[in-house]
Amino acid sequence: GWVWNQFFVPEEMNTTSHHIGQLRSDLDNGNNSFQYKLLGAGAGSTFIIDERTGDIYAIQKLDREERSLYILRAQVIDIATGRAVEPESEFVIKVSDINDNEPKFLDEPYEAIVPEMSPEGTLVIQVTASDADDPSSGNNARLLYSLLQGQPYFSVEPTTGVIRISSKMDRELQDEYWVIIQAKDMIGQPGALSGTTSVLIKLSDVNDNKPIFKESLYRLTVSESAPTGTSIGTIMAYDNDIGENAEMDYSIEEDDSQTFDIITNHETQEGIVILKKKVDFEHQNHYGIRAKVKNHHVPEQLMKYHTEASTTFIKIQVEDVDEP
């Protein structure tokens, strides 16, 4: 019968001829009366056999990631008779792995959106690298993830690639962050190969800023001939938030005379001071009113940012009109 051990050949061997092992018949007494032949894909080009001894050699550099095993056939013939000594047999040559592939992030580019002020531990995104080396061969494809850029705001779980928030962030200070993640094979041991990826993390707005008046004091004038409903001027607050979180409502906080009103222009986010009652210069020609401004939408959990509405004082001077 045939005698052989399992055949392995390391990939990427640079030698011109690498001895893999020996194929022989147990009838072979070593007197060179038998001839060994190799058949199948790779026979003669990738692998050769010593016809007399049955020794098998790899004569080409192999790449496991291209092809990890070869199935060949062996024959042994009695030279004298030309007859097969053993039935033709199939055997396998396995290409063994070396760590010749770095981890690669295949789903690039990575982008994630997370609300500003999210608590520590909030999951942002998971990045995954793949390594073409053999996962069953030692640590060649066992990866560890680490953060090269992004501290102190982000952290990455070493074995999963899950990125989490490690420090609260304020969109109004910085609205996006570039995080660089490294994946290293060999679980970080010497000889490890690595790959990196960038993750763009954008902060979405939450309503953590209340509107604040641009001026603590405004001065407006109104003619005593102005009819009720007249717009006598505008006031304006600013809000560092954006979109719906910056929508505001103006109102009167204090007007003993009940002469004025404030309406909100929701397109410009300005407050428009309106004459509610006609004024009479001879009766009163100086008014003072206090206005306040609040956000339109404030979720309950964000109310802590909206205690005490911003206020402004408006001095209104009545202009005299000569009466007939």
Epitope: E215, S216, R219, Q284, H286
Partner: antibody, heavy 120, light 107 residues
Framework: QVQLQESGPGLVKPSQTLSLTCTVS??????????WSWIRQHPGKGLEWIGY???????YYNPSLKSRVTISVDTSKNQFSLKLSSVTAADTAVYYC????????????WGQGTLVTVSS | EIVLTQSPGTLSLSPGERATLSCRAS???????LAWYQQKPGQAPRLLIY???SRATGIPDRFSGSGSGTDFTLTISRLEPEDFTVYYC????????FGPGTKVDIK
């Protein structure tokens, strides 16, 4: 802290024009919403508001003095001025400049006052 | 114009006593448009109260203001030696007018 300082002649002849200047320091006369007033106090008597000006030049005067009073402003010098024409002995008084408040038309800041005597 | 009348003209009290000064307007004024000042000899008036019960910056809490309509009051809860001087009320709704003053002197 806003400070105001009056300056001008302490003696004016009858029928002439009294001229005083108020220099503002520690704040801009162009601050939005503030009015700059002149107020006087006859010797041993009460206070009388003369008029005010806004940094834009808009002025408003006490109706009883309106025909004789002009208040002007010079934002580049951070000053405002009072001119009172055709003075008589009844215009002898301590003249104060003042700025109104951030929550109303009351007088929050005052100069120390300057005595102007009308006499020949 | 709105005329302000202050009473009494002179108030004689001892240190530690409570002083109640009155200011009456010739017609209704909104309470938001009245102020009180203190004036010491040779000095400019100093704002005490505005609107009519808000204390100006740096004013001790023994000074308080109240009132509405035509009747307003300045109260000094416990007179200190430096409080013996002249007090004026002022309205700032219809132009600007001052009361004639109340002198608080030591009994």
């Amino acid at each position: 802290q806003v400070q105001l300082q009056e300056s001008g002649p302490g003696l004016v002849k009858p029928s002439q024009t009294l001229s005083l200047t108020c220099t503002v320091s520690g704040g801009s006369i162009s601050s939005s919403g503030y009015y700059w007033s002149w107020i006087r106090q006859h010797p041993g008597k009460g206070l009388e508001w003369i008029g005010y000006i806004y940094y834009t030049g808009s002025a408003y005067y006490n109706p009883s003095l309106k025909s004789r009073v002009t208040i002007s402003v010079d934002t580049s010098k951070n000053q405002f001025s009072l001119k009172l024409s055709s003075v008589t002995a009844a215009d002898t008084a301590v003249y104060y400049c003042a700025r109104d408040g951030s929550s109303g038309w009351y007088f929050q800041y005052w100069g120390q006052g300057t005595l102007v005597t009308v006499s020949s | 114009e709105i005329v302000l009348t202050q009473s009494p003209g002179t108030l004689s009290l001892s240190p530690g006593e409570r002083a109640t000064l009155s200011c009456r307007a010739s017609r209704n004024i909104s309470s938001s448009y009245l102020a009180w000042y203190q004036q010491k000899p040779g000095q400019a008036p100093r704002l005490l109260i505005y609107g009519p019960s808000s204390r100006a910056t740096g004013i001790p809490d023994r000074f308080s203001g109240s009132g509405s309509g035509t009747d307003f009051t300045l109260t000094i809860s416990r007179l200190e030696p430096e409080d013996f001087t002249v007090y004026y009320c002022q309205q700032y709704g219809s132009s600007f007018t001052f009361g004639p003053g109340t002198k608080v002197d030591i009994k």
